[in-house]
């Protein structure tokens, strides 16, 4: 009986540790996509609607803030699209990029952790264009560090929650 009690207590402890594991999945807020034709920071994301969720991490001022030291898997998916019903592209040669950046407040510094994208030729003869970028990686993050997303040509972002999103989840502690 004691073994059973110990076992269930162990399960509970494991479960509560898992539940405390930080994670976040943030989806683009389509009502507040910034303008610009160069690299801009995307600061408006949902954290609590649709597919978006957050636990033991903080979302503030457009940045995802780490609350616990650890090794995290970071990912971002950015979709760009253009349909002729919205008008014409002023230029057919495009650089479509995403940058995942880490900012440290304690030692003021900023580093690009991941970038992805391509130069594209989106011909005016086509009715519809689409391009998707997915980046992901494993990083040591400290409490207080902030993750943010920058993109080129935000006016071409696909505003759907299944198209433009980023997130993180803690995989293990720092030994």
């Amino acid at each position: 009986e004691k073994a059973m009690v110990d076992g269930s207590w162990l399960d509970l402890a494991k479960r509560s540790k898992l539940e405390a594991q930080p994670f976040a999945h943030l989806t683009i807020n389509a009502t507040d996509i910034p303008s610009g034709s160069h690299k801009v920071s995307l600061s408006s994301w949902y954290h609590d609607r649709g597919w978006a969720k957050i636990s033991n991490m903080t979302f503030s001022n457009g940045k995802l803030i780490v609350n616990q030291d650890g090794f995290y898997y970071l990912y971002a998916n950015i979709c760009f699209r253009h349909h002729e019903t919205s008008g014409d592209l002023a230029t057919e040669y495009l650089q479509l990029m995403v940058y995942v950046t880490k900012t440290s407040i304690k030692i003021p510094s900023s580093h690009t952790l991941m970038k992805g994208g391509s130069t594209k030729y989106w011909s005016g003869n086509s009715e519809f264009h689409f391009y998707s970028i997915n980046v992901g990686g494993f990083f040591k993050l400290r409490s207080g560090e902030e993750i943010s997303i920058e993109v080129s040509n935000p006016s071409l972002l696909d505003p759907d929650q299944d198209a433009t999103y980023f997130g993180a989840f803690k995989v293990r502690d720092i030994d």
Epitope: S35, L89, A90
Partner: antibody, heavy 126, light 103 residues
């Protein structure tokens, strides 16, 4: 305030060419596209083409492809539309119009014409 | 190629009347629809963009609605200065125009 001032009326014989100018003032010319639209007597408005004043990129209606040239002089904040091989059906009022989209803020030419020139009457007659 | 069709082609109404002009697109164009006012010898004027957004400086008696393929321009209380031809437009395509006159 934003103004587009076009050149005066022109009379041409069939087969000739005409070049209409559109001088912009009151805004940063290079940050916007200029469209050319015409209206023949008793007809609907007809889009002809646009020029991105910043980079000089152009797009034309297939109807005018090969007959139309649109250029710009950024120093003079002026756009030009030349139509060649004129025929009587080209008799119309030709307008320049500014696209509402600021190219600094995005790269979509939206076809919302927020300011127009006063129009230039081109008459093609033998 | 999208085709824009306006109705009616002309109408006559009294000052103070509510006037409605309809524009249909041959396929869905979301809300990418604009309305212009043309008076003889004057530069055309953008009234409504994006189906329902009132252009700066345009009187509030003008309003636009619709999405997909069917749109309307409404003048809530017709004024003498509203005598003009009105055109709907989606990117490169214009409607054939609606001439508004006073009875």
């Amino acid at each position: 305030q934003v103004q587009l001032v076009q050149s005066g009326a022109e009379v041409r014989k069939p087969g000739a060419s005409v070049k209409v100018s559109c001088k912009a003032s009151g805004y940063d010319f290079s940050n916007y596209a200029i469209h050319w639209v015409r209206q023949a007597p008793g007809q609907r408005l007809e889009w002809m083409g646009w020029i991105n004043a910043g980079n000089g990129n152009t797009k034309f209606s297939q109807k005018f492809q090969g007959r139309i040239t649109v250029t710009r002089d950024t120093a003079a904040s002026t756009a030009y539309m030349e139509l060649r091989s004129l025929r009587s059906e080209d008799t119309a009022v030709y307008y320049c119009a500014r696209d509402i989209s600021n190219m600094v803020r995005g790269i979509i030419i939206a076809y919302y014409f927020d300011y127009w020139g006063q129009g230039t009457l081109v008459t093609v007659s033998s | 190629e999208i085709v824009m069709t306006q109705s009616p082609s002309s109408l006559s109404a009294s000052v103070g009347d509510r006037v409605t002009i309809t524009c249909r697109a041959s396929q869905s164009i979301s809300r990418y629809l604009n309305w212009y006012q043309l008076k003889p010898g004057k530069a055309p004027r953008l009234l409504i963009y994006g189906a329902s957004s009132l252009q700066s400086g345009v009187p509030s008696r003008f309003s636009g609605s619709g999405s997909g393929a069917e749109f309307t321009l409404t003048i809530s209380s017709l004024q003498p200065e509203d005598i003009a031809t009105y055109y709907c437009q989606h990117t490169r395509a214009f409607g054939q125009g609606t001439k508004v006159e006073i009875k």
